[in-house]
């Protein structure tokens, strides 16, 4: 094993310089101190090395620090940062934004989204605020990262993020984080009026309550049916045939090809087969007349 | 995009001498490292000599340090090993590289040299 030799007479480098190109690799692991390559930084990135000689000086540093990289070496590790895991970052504490955004320039084109998420991520969970300037500097990097976050990290970006949010980039978030993005997106876009407002609102509106729903019925949104697919089934159940018309317009006649899927079948099986007949799109699968409907989810009523 | 290529390898007997040449395109004046490296079968690949375009500084390791030369015509954008007094020892392919941002970035595919005792 490359560890158990000793580094040999007079090869214990006191400084990163050109001699260590030429080092072989056990000898980089005898004689290479991680303290040391911790200082001088700087010159790891200037001076170029194998990746098979970075691998082993990663390998060094990990040593030296068990528990994590101090800040004080993040902020010096420039191109070094190419080489870290998003293990690895999770165990950082980082909170300076301009390390966050040094380290996000170098990540830039080189396939590290997983790493630059970890390393807002890691910034956030340290009280730090996501600002407009750290989303650009993200760059292409899809939002979807916003539904990694920890509900708590959430908290601190700032509402004005939203605006920046596509339609596909919440795809994949959970209910709690859908809600919590919903409210950002209500204050973020609170001096947008109409139709603006319901372009910019109807990507978040998978958080949406069902108070919400009835809401934005009363201003003739004409929602489309991916957006009203979108909608969580809770919210949605809640909702009558005559606020389900008023918020679908004309698009009410997209109903039928979804009445078998969910969430639009979740509806369906609330509510009355004749309020359904009414629409005359012959939608099935509500309530037979006559029915009475006990839901036993109200539990105070039993109480 | 970066692209090197190598020529001049060779079969050779111990003591005689060989010119590696390194035809870089695509380089752009930003990459300021260039290098040799060899690889014998077997063995780890080995810095052999580096050259700091900046100020032109070279750089060896011990094994080829007064028999190698490294150099580079930056106008022809071709970097140079001159290989001299060559020992069977150095037989291995030789590629070259451009070092850009603390990595060797851009590798040639390698020329092979062989020496014979």
């Known amino acids: 094993d490359a560890e158990q030799k000793a580094c040999p007479p007079g090869k214990e480098p006191y400084k990163v310089d050109e001699d260590l190109i030429f080092y072989q690799n056990w000898e980089l692991e005898a004689c290479v101190d991680g303290t040391m390559l911790a200082r001088q930084m700087d010159l790891v990135n200037e001076i170029p090395f194998t990746y098979e000689q970075l691998s082993i000086f990663k390998h060094k540093l990990d040593k030296t620090y068990p528990q994590g990289y101090p800040e004080s070496l993040i902020q010096q590790l420039g191109h070094f940062f190419r080489y870290v895991s998003p293990e690895d970052i999770h165990q950082w504490n980082v909170t300076s934004p301009d390390t966050v955004k040094t380290l996000l320039k170098v990540s830039k084109g080189q396939k590290m989204n997983a790493q630059a998420i970890a390393l807002v991520a890691c910034y956030l969970r340290g009280g730090g605020q996501l600002d407009e300037d750290m989303v650009k500097a993200l760059g292409d990097i899809p939002l979807s990262y916003l539904c990694d976050f920890s509900p708590q990290d959430l908290h601190s970006v700032p509402s004005s993020v939203m605006w920046l949010v596509g339609p596909q980039d919440l795809d994949k978030c959970s209910q709690r984080h859908l809600g919590l993005l919903y409210q950002k997106a209500c204050s973020a876009f609170q001096n947008v009026s109409g139709l603006e407002y319901f372009e910019k609102i109807k990507t978040f509106l998978g958080g949406a309550s069902v108070k919400d729903l009835r809401a934005l019925s009363q201003h003739n949104v004409s929602m489309d049916i991916a957006t009203f697919k979108r909608l969580q089934v809770d919210s949605l159940v809640g909702l009558s045939v005559a606020e389900v018309q008023k918020l679908l317009g004309p698009n009410i006649v997209d109903l039928k090809t979804e009445e078998d899927k969910s969430p639009v079948r979740d509806w369906l099986f609330r509510q009355h087969q004749k309020d359904l007949d009414r629409l005359g799109l012959g939608l099935q699968g509500g309530i037979p007349n006559g029915y009475l409907v006990l839901d036993f989810n109200v539990r105070e009523a039993f109480s | 995009q970066v692209k090197l290529e190598e020529s001049g390898g060779g079969s050779v007997q111990a003591g005689g001498s060989l010119r590696l040449s390194c035809t870089t395109s695509?380089?752009?004046?930003?990459y300021k490292w260039m290098g040799w490296f060899r690889q014998a079968p077997g063995q780890e690949r080995e810095g052999?000599?580096?050259?700091?375009?900046?100020?032109?500084?070279?750089y060896y390791s011990d094994s080829v340090k007064g028999r190698f030369t490294i150099s580079r015509d930056n106008a022809k954008n071709m970097i140079y090993l001159d290989m001299t007094r060559l020992r069977p020892e150095d037989s291995a392919v030789y590629e070259c590289a451009i070092g850009h941002d603390g990595a060797w970035r851009y590798w040639g595919q390698g020329t092979q040299v062989t020496v014979s005792s």
């Open positions: 052999v000599a580096v050259i700091y375009t900046g100020n032109d500084r070279t």
């Open positions: 695509g380089y752009t004046n930003s």
